[in-house]
């Protein structure tokens, strides 16, 4: 087909981050098209030679994708008419980290937006009263976090409270060699409060918290993306 | 201030081989992928090769393949193009220059090669 | 392989537009760039993605892009725009650049 007229259609991305070894998107819609056929889309990356993804005449064409993205990528090929140009990544990789174009052709015209893309590894918390410590104490777990995280621990009783003095994070390599297993421990823990673990690197935090009273244990855990609208 | 400086530039027998480099500053060499751009006296630009971030990918363009080698240090922020089997239609100013996307933002000051016996 | 088809020379008196044409097969679904080159010296973008400047290029220059064509048009022409300009894009893991225009400045 061929472009008539100089118009510019809108395209809009998301900074996004993937988790390595987990499917991630980024996110990329535009003004739609009635045609599917009339509708190319183009994925770039930046330091990439080949084409990460391209989807033309309502099929994916991959002539000219690049090595490192052979097999891993897919679009949302029954929404692309109503305008969503969604990139899905499979098995994220560390090095799939930086910035992305999402680079749009209809019969409307021409656009394309850019997206900064974060890699790492992120995971929920869990807090568990210890046992098996001498002490009242807690044990707060996360499997994977990359890169390395800072684990801070609060109270609401104390709020405010330091307790960096009575906790103990360490971190283990995971066998994959990237990621890594976080475990804090928090000692001299009083009954009737609620304590959070809080663990956050530059692409995620995530919160566990943990509600200890004399009848029973509460436990809850959140995790969000950083310098993302996803 | 982002800059590209080419060397290695010179005259050359006919079948012989030169190594042009490119030193990059003022930007993030290995976030790039890069390129050898060449200028015969009085023609146009011609692409010659193109090389990815990270030294993994190459691409040549027709006239070249075989003969020429696209490389990078990203340790010491430089591009090489190892030119072999060298003949007169080769003679040109070499240009190094960064790829953006599907254009080239910056550009080197360029080096003289002479192929002739 | 793919060919871009210049116009070999414009000439345009100053204070004038200038517009430097740039043909192709459906050009218009390909993204162009375009380079202003003056003598002895290195090429620099004046306009990419079609119609886009880098930052430090006037807004005399402006691009366009449809069908069969794209134009690089200088508005206001200046006597320190007389230089070559290439067009330029990406077709089947080749950068490809046209034949050159030089603009003369009456």
């Known amino acids: 087909f061929g472009i008539s007229g100089r118009h510019s259609i809108t395209v809009t991305t998301v900074a996004s981050a993937g988790n390595i070894g987990e499917d991630g998107i980024l996110s990329c819609t535009f003004e739609p098209d009635i045609k599917l056929s009339d509708i190319v889309i183009q994925w770039l990356k930046e330091g990439v030679l080949g084409l990460v993804h391209e989807f033309k005449e309502g099929k994916d064409e991959l002539s000219e994708q690049d090595e490192m993205f052979r097999g891993r990528t897919a679009v949302f090929a029954d929404q692309v008419i109503v305008g969503n140009a969604s990139l899905r990544l499979k098995n994220v990789q560390l090095t799939d980290a930086g910035t992305y174009k999402c680079y749009i052709i209809t019969s409307k015209g021409k656009g394309n937006a850019n997206l900064e893309y974060k890699t790492g590894a992120f995971s929920m918390p869990e807090v568990n009263v210890d046992y098996n410590a001498s002490s009242e104490t807690l044990r707060c777990e996360a499997p994977r976090w990359f890169p390395q995280p800072t684990v801070v621990w609060a109270s609401q009783v104390d709020q405010g409270a330091n307790f960096s003095e009575v906790s103990n994070t360490s971190f283990e390599l995971n066998s994959e060699n990237v990621t890594m297993k976080v475990v804090s421990v928090l000692y001299n823990v009083t009954i009737n409060n609620t304590y959070s673990c809080m663990i956050e690197n530059d692409i995620a935090k995530a919160t566990g918290d943990i509600k200890v009273t004399e009848s029973e244990i509460k436990r809850r855990s959140h995790l969000q993306l950083l310098n993302s609208k996803a | 201030e982002v800059q590209l400086v080419e060397s290695g530039g010179g005259v050359v027998q006919p079948g012989r081989s030169l190594r042009l480099s490119c030193a990059a500053s003022g930007f993030t060499f290995s976030s790039y992928s890069m390129n050898w751009v060449r200028q015969a006296p009085g023609k146009g630009l011609e692409w010659v090769s193109a090389?990815?971030?990270?030294?993994?990918?190459?691409y040549y363009a027709d006239s070249v393949k075989g003969r020429f080698t696209i490389s990078r240090d990203n340790s010491k922020n430089t591009l090489y193009l190892q030119m072999n089997s060298l003949r007169a239609e080769d003679t040109a100013v070499y240009y190094c220059?960064?790829?953006?996307?599907?254009?080239?933002?910056?550009w080197g000051q360029g080096t003289t090669v002479t192929v002739s016996s | 392989s793919y060919e871009l088809t210049q116009p070999p020379s414009v000439s345009v008196a100053p204070g004038k537009t200038a517009r430097i044409t740039c043909g192709g097969n459906?050009?218009?679904?390909?993204?162009v760039h375009w380079y202003q080159q003056k003598p002895g010296q290195a090429p620099v973008l004046v306009v990419y993605?079609?119609?886009d400047r880098p930052s430090g290029i006037p807004e005399r220059f402006s691009g366009s892009n449809s069908g069969n064509t794209a134009t690089l048009t200088i508005s206001r022409v200046e006597a320190g725009d007389e230089a070559d300009y290439y067009c330029?894009?990406?077709?089947?893991?080749?950068?490809?650049f046209g034949t050159g225009t030089k603009l003369t400045v009456l």
């Open positions: 220059a960064r790829k953006r996307w599907y254009g080239m933002d910056v």
């Open positions: 459906n050009i218009g679904s390909k993204s």
């Open positions: 993605d079609d119609s």
């Open positions: 330029q894009v990406w077709d089947s893991r080749t950068y490809v």
């Open positions: 090389i990815s971030g990270s030294g993994g990918s190459t």
